[in-house]
């Protein structure tokens, strides 16, 4: 019979970017296992990542279901063998996570630059509307579909001869800049929900300059 | 076909051991949980624990902690389930069952043909 | 441990009947519950998996359903292959726990 006893789970963590969430916590469990558990406020516990050794566990099926909810999730220690267990009168040890709410909460990925078309003085940028893994009638929604006129972007361009920067911003995924003729602009997009209080904005795109492959140019 | 087969019945004597058996086939061994249910004359189901064939961790119920240990080899895909200090009372037919993963639902969807266990002096 | 109180623990019907067999458990356990039929000398074999879905190759007159902790299991013909003791089996908790079982009969 082992001596180690069970310890209950510490430092539980939401990592959440596009809808895509995981649980993390401490430690590395020696001879223990893990079970965790995801509930609404007024909903069911309901059991995932079962008798596991990890120390992580993606809860994206269940948070996806109602992203506006309010999750809260717990991680059961259970003694691996023949371990003795610390719970008192055979409770169950177990910890709680901070409550989570994936619509106010979950990083926006970072955007990608779909294309850039050049009409004259005007260029058009197009960012790629993402994909979550969000569903509904048996679809995967996109960013813009879960998100609304809640979702802009920031575009930040310059022309490639200097370093002095320009911002627009949309509601769309479209922005329609003015460029000086003969010139070429490099761009970079985030993602931004304004009426966020955390997680406001992704990290920047990728740049993307024109006189690469991704743009479309016409006189 | 995914199959379990158990070892054949045993008689033993109240305090001795007995290590039953389950050798898995038709799947990968490693990618799913194995479970062991003994159920006593007449009487219904009870779990005994849980092994992770790919590392070997187990998990007991408490009323086994300490009588009970669940190995595997997997390079015959066989799991063990060793129960000591045998009573009167362990008389049953034990089962192995394959159940479940990390992600998966704990439904037992492949059960062994079971293997009685008789402790008489 | 979870308590799953099955009733009635037997009961006997005509080939043809309905037969409805409840189990309860002791606190929410979701949908985590599974319903097994064991026929006399033989390993048992699940037939519902998360309170309501039909494993593959189960014939669809058994079906499963949840109300809260009170769930509901259902042959709505009943076959005379059908005489055995169906058990529930919970998996929120652990550790694992069965129902004691419904012995069903023909009339």
């Known amino acids: 019979s082992g001596t180690t006893n069970t310890v209950a789970a510490y430092n539980l963590t939401w990592k959440s970017t596009n809808f895509k969430t995981i649980l993390e916590w401490e430690p590395k469990p020696v001879n223990q296992v893990y079970t965790v558990q995801i509930s609404t406020k007024s909903g069911d516990w309901k059991s995932k990542c079962f008798y596991t050794t990890d120390t992580e566990c993606d809860l994206t099926d269940e948070i996806v279901k109602d992203v506006k909810q309010t999750y809260l999730a717990r991680v059961f220690s259970y003694p691996a063998g023949n371990v003795e267990s610390t719970g008192s009168a055979g409770e169950p040890l177990y910890e709680n996570s901070p409550e989570f709410t994936p619509y106010l909460e979950t990083n926006l990925g970072q955007p990608t630059i779909q294309s850039f078309e050049q009409v004259g003085t005007k260029v058009n940028v197009t960012v790629e509307d993402e994909r979550t893994l969000v569903r509904r009638n048996n679809t995967f929604l996109s960013l813009r579909d879960v998100f609304g006129n809640d979702l802009g972007y920031i575009l930040t361009y310059r022309k490639s001869s200097s370093s002095g920067k320009k911002t627009a911003k949309t509601n769309t995924n479209e922005f329609l800049i003015d460029v000086d003729k003969g010139e070429n602009y490099c761009f970079s997009v985030q993602a931004v929900i304004p009426s966020r209080t955390v997680n406001r904005k992704s990290t920047d795109s990728p740049v993307e300059c024109m006189g690469q492959e991704k743009g479309e140019f016409r006189e | 076909q995914v199959q379990l087969v158990q070892s054949g019945a045993e008689v033993k004597k109240p305090g001795a051991s007995v290590k039953v058996s389950c050798k898995a086939s038709?799947?990968?061994?490693?990618?799913?949980?194995m479970h062991w249910v003994r159920q006593a004359p007449g009487q219904g189901l009870e779990w005994m624990g849980i092994?992770?064939?790919?590392?070997?961790?187990?998990v007991y119920a408490q009323k086994f902690q300490g009588r009970v240990t669940m190995t595997r080899d997997t390079s015959t895909s066989t799991v063990y389930m060793e129960l000591s200090s045998l009573r009167s009372e362990d008389t049953a037919v034990y089962y192995c069952?394959?159940?479940?993963?990390?992600?998966?639902?704990?439904?037992?969807?492949?059960w062994g043909q079971g293997t009685m266990v008789t402790v008489s002096s | 441990d979870i308590q799953m109180t099955q009733s009635p623990s037997s009961l006997s019907a005509s080939v043809g009947d309905r037969v409805t067999i409840t189990c309860q458990a002791s606190q929410d356990i979701s949908n985590s519950l599974n319903w097994y039929q064991q026929k006399p000398g033989k390993a048992p074999k699940l037939l519902i998996y998360d309170a309501s879905n039909l494993e593959t190759g189960v014939p669809s007159r058994f079906s499963g359903s949840r109300s809260g902790t009170d769930f509901t299991f259902t042959i709505s013909s009943l076959q005379p292959e059908d005489i055995a003791t169906y058990y529930c089996q919970q998996y929120n908790f652990h550790p694992l726990t069965f129902g004691g079982g419904t012995k069903v009969e023909i009339k």
């Open positions: 069952a394959r159940g479940g993963s990390k992600v998966a639902a704990l439904a037992f969807d492949i």
């Open positions: 038709g799947y990968t061994f490693a990618n799913y949980y």
């Open positions: 092994i992770n064939p790919s590392g070997g961790i187990t």
